[in-house]
């Protein structure tokens, strides 16, 4: 018996508007009905929770109103979008999946997605 496998892309480049999207896919050992997904960021030996959502299979992911994350679920796949990113937010973003109900509980952690964020150059002043 091993830890639940979680797959996510190795690298993602955020858009010029500071938006990054990636898929987090998990190999469910059972028929979970309640799943918790947490996005963690590891950078400079610090680990912070970016966002988290608990959802019922077949329903939408619901993050807190002030969350920088949005997402949708389809089967054992979660499509995550993180907004408002700046260059200083570059780091390794890890998908943590917990099968909460019914028992038994399972935990899986992905190998992380390195998200690169490049702040856009300011527009030059126009003479017009």
């Amino acid at each position: 018996c091993k830890a639940m496998h979680v797959a996510q892309p190795a690298v993602v480049l955020a858009s010029s508007r500071g938006i990054a999207s990636f898929v987090c896919e998990y190999a469910s050992p059972g028929k979970a009905t309640e799943v918790r997904v947490t996005v963690l960021r590891q950078a400079d030996s610090q680990v912070t929770e970016v966002c988290a959502a608990t959802y019922m299979m077949g329903n939408e992911l619901t993050f807190l109103d002030d969350s920088i994350c949005t997402g949708t679920s389809s089967g054992n796949q979660v499509n995550l979008t993180i907004q408002g990113l700046r260059a200083m937010d570059t780091g390794l973003y890890i998908c943590k999946v917990e099968l909460m109900y019914p028992p038994p509980y399972y935990l899986g952690i992905g190998n992380g997605t390195q998200i690169y964020v490049i702040d856009p150059e300011p527009c030059p002043d126009s003479d017009f």
Epitope: C1, K2, L40, S45, E49, Y105, L107, I109, N111
Partner: nanobody, 127 residues
Framework: EVQLVESGGGLVQPGGSLRLSCAAS????????IGWFRQAPGKERETVSC??????SYADSVKGRFTISRDNSKNTVYLQMNSLRAEDTAVYYC??????????????????????WTQGTQVTVSS
């Protein structure tokens, strides 16, 4: 699936020793980091120590006093606590995390990476 059960808490005088055990069933410990955490009343849960196949890590507050070890034949992780102080009084929890290549000495004990939390065992250091 992994199931963890901890034991060994109790009341001890300052300067005394205790050994906590965390026994795993349902899986070998090999692919996991096992961590010890503690929570004092009114405070956040904090890292004490953790161990994987090749590395150990400790919170600064317990370095030199606590020792973590694992016995793979018994599927058990131990936390030997010596020179106990009043400030070590807390509920102690054992938890597991899948061992990942990106874990560093500084991050492998981070509580965000853990699950399979035990119910906790009370450790009270008092005269």
């Amino acid at each position: 699936e992994v199931q963890l059960v901890e034991s060994g808490g109790g009341l001890v005088q300052p300067g005394g020793s205790l050994r906590l055990s965390c026994a795993a069933s349902g899986s070998t410990l090999d692919p996991f980091v096992i961590g010890w955490f503690r929570q004092a009343p009114g405070k956040e849960r904090e890292t004490v120590s953790c161990i994987n196949r090749s590395r150990t890590s400790y919170a600064d507050s317990v370095k030199g006093r606590f020792t973590i070890s694992r016995d793979n034949s018994k599927n058990t992780v131990y936390l030997q606590m010596n020179s106990l102080r009043a400030e070590d009084t807390a509920v102690y929890y054992c938890a597991a995390s899948p061992d990942k290549p990106f874990y560093t000495d500084q991050t492998m004990c981070n509580k965000h990476y853990y699950g399979y939390w035990t119910q906790g065992t009370q450790v009270t250091v008092s005269s």
